[in-house]
């Protein structure tokens, strides 16, 4: 628990350099995000494809979208889960991290030092061992997060099933209802290719209890979609006299010494350039 209060931001006096004052784990071990670069990568043949079960959510059901002052979060049902880890991990929520219109490079994880435009996190908890995400969040093996790197490109109708509701959650504390849809559509191609490491929550309290799966391949959203994400939301309540835009809500990459990130793929990308046959 924090030493006092739960006020933290991505900018200013309560920004990430101050997190560890109130949240000691933020200055501790196994911190995320990290830079994924060749020196720390090791192929692991035992990393088999994950199965995404119960991800196809019925549109007859309503799911709560919330502006929590740090991101936009979609609640997920507990019967949605990942198969293929040591335990069953049930979904609890997804949220995004992004930059700003002048510097649209707001992913949390980086690859060879390069940021992507944004990043999606689908958070799961160990439901074999713990009754809910809150209980699991500070326990060993408690959480598993799927991370999707997002780049600017073509329009993505699946991501728009979230983005089209942003106007109803403009301010902190506002909530809207989103029809269920197939969450698997938010994942990239070839989900069997991923990076795997043990790390932490990227936001306070930064518990070092997360099994990270970062998909190798990014998804694309359009420039307009990215701009909507970067401009639609505020960190502050509707009646706040000093509104703050919700931008640059990503943590800097953390030190990753004497540890490895395991990959489910061998390093060489297959060349598929046009003209080769």
């Amino acid at each position: 628990a924090p030493v006092n209060g739960s006020k933290w931001t991505y900018f200013g006096p309560d920004g990430e350099n101050s997190w560890s004052k109130k949240y000691p784990s933020c200055g501790g071990l196994l911190q995320s995000p990290i830079d994924l670069h060749s020196d720390i990568l090791q192929y692991d043949a035992s990393l088999t494809p994950l199965e995404f079960q119960g991800y196809n959510l019925s549109a007859n059901k309503q799911f709560l979208l919330t502006n929590n002052g740090h991101s936009v979060k979609l609640n997920l049902p507990s019967d949605m889960h990942i198969q293929g880890l040591q335990s069953r991990y049930s979904a609890t929520q997804l949220h995004l991290h992004w930059g700003n219109p002048n510097d649209p490079h707001g992913s949390e994880h980086t690859v060879s030092g390069q940021h992507f435009a944004a990043e999606l996190h689908i958070v799961h908890y160990n439901s074999d061992l713990y009754p809910d995400a809150s209980t699991a969040s500070n326990k060993s093996e408690g959480l598993a997060v799927l991370a999707v790197l997002i780049e600017m490109g073509s329009f993505n109708p699946s991501y728009d099933k979230i983005f089209s509701h942003l106007q109803h959650v403009k301010y902190k504390g506002q909530e809207a209802f989103v029809p269920g849809f197939n969450i698997e559509e938010l994942l990239p191609e070839r989900t069997a290719e991923y990076y795997r490491y043990r790390g932490s929550l990227t936001t306070p309290p930064c518990n070092p209890t997360v099994l990270w799966t970062v998909f190798r391949n990014p998804v694309q959203i359009s420039q307009e979609q990215l701009l909507a994400l970067e401009t639609a939301l505020y960190c502050t309540h509707m009646d706040d006299p000093s509104p703050r835009e919700m931008i640059n809500n990503f943590r800097q990459v953390q030190k990753f010494d004497e540890r490895l990130v395991y990959t489910s793929f061998s390093q060489v990308q297959v060349c598929t350039a046009a003209g080769l046959s």
């Epitope: 019925s58 549109a59 007859n60 059901k61 309503q62 709560l64 609640n75 049902p77 507990s78 019967d79 106007q167 109803h168 506002q174 909530e175 809207a176 209802f177 029809p179």
Partner: antibody
């Protein structure tokens, strides 16, 4: 025929609690959320909360958080509303309802007949 | 919370009259639903998605509007239309209803 039937209403002492039931029939029970909506005498409709019968996940109107608990028994196709610390203002007809998604919109297509709860000493 | 204000709260009209009920939301909503309720009965879905009539609802009913202002119109009031009508939004949590408009016989 799709049907929702509420029961469990009646006279309750102030400070007491109630447990209402909503039995569903005529459709695949876990495919739709079940909502509780109440209507005070001569007043409008007020949403209390809902449950996803497939997994028991609940969402509440903030106004009722901590005082209302919605649960489900899948084997009986029945949802329950428990409300504690009742006061006179909780006197109302309590309805359960099912929303359907049709042509990009939800609406409450099926309602129970309602059950009257009177809070009085 | 999005407050829904219906006007008028009640009206008296004669059979054959054109009747318009307004629902104003305190913040913009994507679409509006309307329900009809008769005394001692549960509400019935009437109009969904602002303008789509639920199956079985007579074509003399129509709905329109966008943003914060929505209307339900009955082009030629019939005896079976005397009831209370409620608007409802589903854009924001909590979902909210209007306080109702009672349509009475003059």
């Amino acid at each position: 025929e799709v049907q929702l039937v509420e029961s469990g209403g009646g006279l309750v002492q102030p400070g007491g609690s109630l447990r209402l039931s909503c039995a569903a029939s005529g459709y695949s029970y876990t495919d739709y959320n079940i909502y509780w909506v109440r209507q005070a005498p001569g007043k409008g409709l007020e949403w209390v909360g809902y449950i996803d019968p497939a997994n028991g996940d609940t969402t509440y109107n903030q106004k009722f958080k901590g005082r209302a608990t919605i649960s489900v028994d899948k084997s009986k196709n029945t949802a329950y509303l428990q409300m504690n610390s009742l006061r006179a203002e909780d006197t109302a007809v309590y309805y359960c309802s099912r929303p359907i998604y049709y042509g990009a919109y939800w609406y409450f297509d099926v309602w129970g007949q309602g059950t009257l709860v009177t809070v009085s000493s | 919370d999005i407050q829904m204000t219906q006007s008028p709260s009640s009206l008296s009209a004669s059979v054959g009259d054109r009747v318009t009920i307004t629902c104003r939301a305190s913040s913009s909503v994507t679409y509006m639903h309307w329900y009809q309720q008769k005394p001692g009965k549960a509400p019935k879905p009437w109009i969904y998605g602002t303008s789509r009539l639920v199956s079985g609802v007579p074509s003399r009913f129509s709905g329109s509007g966008s943003g914060t202002d929505f209307t339900l119109t009955i082009s030629s009031l019939q005896p079976e239309d005397f009831a209370t009508y409620y608007c409802q939004q589903w854009s924001s949590n909590p979902l909210t209803f209007g306080q109702g408009t009672k349509v009475e016989i003059k």
